[in-house]
Amino acid sequence: MAVTACQGLGFVVSLIGIAGIIAATCMDQWSTQDLYNNPVTAVFNYQGLWRSCVRESSGFTECRGYFTLLGLPAMLQAVRALMIVGIVLGAIGLLVSIFALKCIRIGSMEDSAKANMTLTSGIMFIVSGLCAIAGVSVFANMLVTNFWMSTANMYTGMGGMVQTVQTRYTFGAALFVGWVAGGLTLIGGVMMCIACRGLAPEETNYKAVSYHASGHSVAYKPGGFKASTGFGSNTKNKKIYDGGARTEDEVQSYPSKHDYV
């Protein structure tokens, strides 16, 4: 039950995280105009990964896409790539994890297969979250560098009288969405990996027990179970004799009313 809850929660957290990563990637407010030096501007600038926008106080907003690939900074391209990789991995992870969910039955899929799929999706979520966090952090670092560079030459005097105020940009809402979303995806991935350990059939030390059947006696001997870590092993626990006794893992592999959430 705890495994199912951990897996389900991991899935939900990852789902929210990936939705957040997608939202952050699409958002226009990755960097917003710093109003500290000019709080009374009638024009507000903000930029995203795909386009830059200008919002006038009158309510009109104009956005222009970056219609060039070669003309864009390498760092921006890198951030785009990281976010897209994060989304793709996350999406694949979600697809895999749906089939890996313990509460969903697909044919006669064994627990070890579900464990492997859970682990795979967990790793994908972790990498996806790391990609998003890395992408957002690279962009944030770029902003900080540019901010202090533009602060150094904030005013360029023209004839000593006229001032040209250079527009500085600070962290936009998308950065915070990206960081939180990346963190959630990462946490979801870790939860999936933890759930995987619970799903995987574990090695159990059974003591030798004698069962006296009518007719002849058969003894169960220890060591008849093949150890399985759940990390790639697809072998089911082997039975020496299929009498009336079942291992704990085998009992769980059949549907019960507790398996459906």
Partner: antibody, heavy 117, light 113 residues
């Protein structure tokens, strides 16, 4: 079509509060900003302040302590209040709609307010 | 506050001739985000409210004759009437629409010579 009409008392006594109303039609006050501008007789234009679609306001730094701009969206009205008036506040007061580039694309006909005892 | 300075204060031009009015701002009105200059030109005829001619320094408002054109960038701007007509006699104002307060220039009175 877009129309703006200023109304209010034509004569205000010194130290009193000047109150004007701008009634608009043809556009929504939730979507567009409305500015107040004044023009003393024979002089140039002076921007007083603005109320934007979201209700936020900006005022001229020289008038900020005396001016208040508000609106009643349901009645499509914008209000200007200027306190502690003096003879220097005698002017034609205009209200105007803000458009692209923050430019004032539609103006009212203006109303002359004289400050005198 | 941004100070807008217009020159000349008054201008007399013959009908059909070119009229040029200048406007200078104390700070740049160029917005880096969209590379547009937030400067507006208005025309005010006697006894009438001002009328919008040009916004973004060079974009003509709909219905404005194409003899009116705006140019300039940063801090220096020009309004040009290519061929002066009798109905163009008015006072012309420039306005900063970039930073609050949205200050006006002192105005240029255009007359026929």
């Amino acid at each position: 079509q877009v129309q703006l009409q200023e109304s209010g008392p034509g004569l205000v006594k010194p130290s009193e509060t000047l109150s004007l109303t701008c009634t608009v039609s043809g556009f929504s006050l939730t979507s567009y900003g409305v500015s107040w501008i004044r023009q003393p007789p024979g002089k140039g234009l002076e921007w007083i302040g603005v109320i934007w679609g979201d209700g936020s306001t900006n005022y001229h730094s020289t008038l900020i302590s005396r001016v208040t701009i508000s609106k009643d969206t349901s009645k499509s009205q914008v209000f200007l209040k200027l306190s502690s008036v003096t003879a220097a506040d005698t002017a034609v007061y205009y209200c105007a709609k803000a458009g692209r580039g923050n430019a004032l694309d539609y103006w009212g006909q203006g109303t002359l307010v004289t400050v005198s005892s | 506050d941004i100070v807008m300075t217009q020159s000349p204060d008054s201008l007399a031009v013959s009908l059909g001739e070119r009229a040029t009015i200048n406007c200078k701002s104390s700070q740049s009105l160029l917005n880096s985000g969209n590379q547009k200059n937030y400067l507006t030109w208005y025309q005010q005829k006697p006894g009438q409210p001002p009328k919008l001619l040009i916004y973004w320094a060079s974009t003509r408002e709909s219905g404005v004759p194409d003899r009116f054109s705006g140019s300039g960038s940063g801090t220096d701007f020009t309004l040009t009437i290519s061929s002066l007509q009798a109905e163009d006699v008015a006072v012309y104002y420039c306005q900063n629409d970039y930073s609050f307060p949205l200050t006006f220039g002192g105005g240029t009175k255009l007359e026929i010579k």
